[in-house]
């Protein structure tokens, strides 16, 4: 004969848990249903009835199976710096990520609770650390021989132009001017735009540091953001 | 849904101590109030501590409060039972189990939970 399939509820055996999308309720001590992801428990089981469920209402979700008496609220509207990636709807939360040239200084559950601007190295800087979704650009001087003379969040410092002859030397935030004879670039490696980070809903994952001689100033809550950095503007 | 593995159980002397820990995978950890529960030979199922949902609250036993700490490490999906000054009626096979979005302690039911780890104090 085949062993009979019990029904919920029904009182466990000794030792044994319940069964896939069930639990065992403390005050009922048998094994009820769970609610469906979207669902909530509107009556809870008792010895001899199972539980009860009911959809979530406008702006509540549940995303796991679960017998929770009240869905959550899902999370207010993504701030004018985010995008919302994920809408609110009965089976998930809103999720809101940082727009283009702005990082999450502040992470919550998913998402991002509180973005920030990327940092822009001024000319004389360039950029030593691209920003990523959860950190910010690291700005570094420009060494001899290079320079940058553009206030961004994704230049580095490029070689200096090497002239036949040198009409004015370049420095940290100028290129070398030429005379008219043509002038040779240096073949130093580089000269290229970092791209901006893209906000995406995939783990966010912590850069790997790279030594630099200009510090990375952070933001200290609940204050406001902290004065620019060596190098940095908040432009 | 989640799957737990307990780990760290073992023979101690009185006045010892141990630490427990639950590795959760299938879904994120912090989505659940979590509770450690133990079993003596011929006894009820007790809970033992508790942790919410939020993490804005923790529930001892009396019977062990200021010697167990609960913890968790939502980064590491992993949660802890530190245990100290045991005594031999703390001999139990300990579980540990959830409750999603569970807002109060102790848990009003159980979700899934581990095989267990057996805890023995003897001298």
């Known amino acids: 004969l085949p062993a009979q399939v019990a029904f919920t509820p029904y009182a466990p055996e000794p030792g044994s848990t319940c069964r896939l999308r069930e639990y065992y309720d403390q005050t009922a001590q048998m094994c009820c249903s769970k609610c469906s992801p979207g669902q909530h428990a509107k009556v809870f089981c008792t010895k001899t009835s199972d539980t009860v469920c009911d959809s979530c209402e406008d702006s509540t979700y549940t995303q796991l199976w679960n017998w929770v008496p009240e869905c959550l609220s899902c999370g207010s509207r993504c701030s004018s710096d985010q995008v919302e990636t994920q809408a609110c709807t009965r089976e998930q939360n809103r999720i809101c990520t940082c727009r283009p040239g702005w990082y999450c200084a502040l992470s919550k559950q998913e998402g991002c609770r509180l973005c920030a601007p990327l940092r822009k190295c001024r000319p004389g800087f360039g950029v030593a650390r691209p920003g990523t979704e959860t950190s910010d650009v690291v700005c570094k001087p420009c060494a001899p021989g290079t320079f940058s003379n553009t206030t961004s969040s994704t230049d580095i410092c490029r070689p200096h132009q090497i002239c036949n002859v040198v009409a004015i030397p370049g420095n940290a935030s100028m290129d070398a001017v030429c005379t008219s004879t043509s002038p040779t670039r240096s073949m130093a490696p580089g000269a290229v735009h970092l791209p901006q980070p893209v906000s995406t809903r995939s783990q966010h994952t912590q850069p790997t540091p790279e030594p630099s001689t200009a510090p990375s100033t952070s933001f200290l809550l609940p204050m406001g953001p902290s004065p620019p950095a060596e190098g940095s503007t908040g432009d | 849904e989640v799957q737990l593995v307990e780990s760290g159980g073992g023979l101690v002397q009185p006045g010892g101590s141990l630490r427990l820990s639950c590795a959760a995978s299938?879904?994120?950890?912090?989505?659940?109030?979590v509770a450690w529960v133990r079993q003596a030979p011929g006894k009820e199922l007790e809970e033992v501590s508790c942790?919410?949902?939020?993490?804005?609250?923790?529930n001892y036993a009396e019977s062990v409060k200021g010697r167990f700490t609960i913890s968790r490490d939502n980064s590491k999906n992993t949660l802890y039972l530190q245990m100290n000054s045991l005594r031999a009626e703390d001999t139990a096979v300990y579980y540990c189990?959830?409750?999603?979005?569970?807002?109060?302690?102790?848990?009003?039911?159980?979700?899934?939970w581990g095989q267990g780890t057996l805890v023995t104090v003897s001298s």
């Open positions: 189990t959830t409750e999603p979005y569970g807002s109060s302690c102790p848990l009003s039911g159980y979700d899934t």
């Open positions: 299938g879904s994120r950890l912090d989505y659940y109030a």
């Open positions: 942790i919410t949902y939020s993490g804005g609250s923790t």
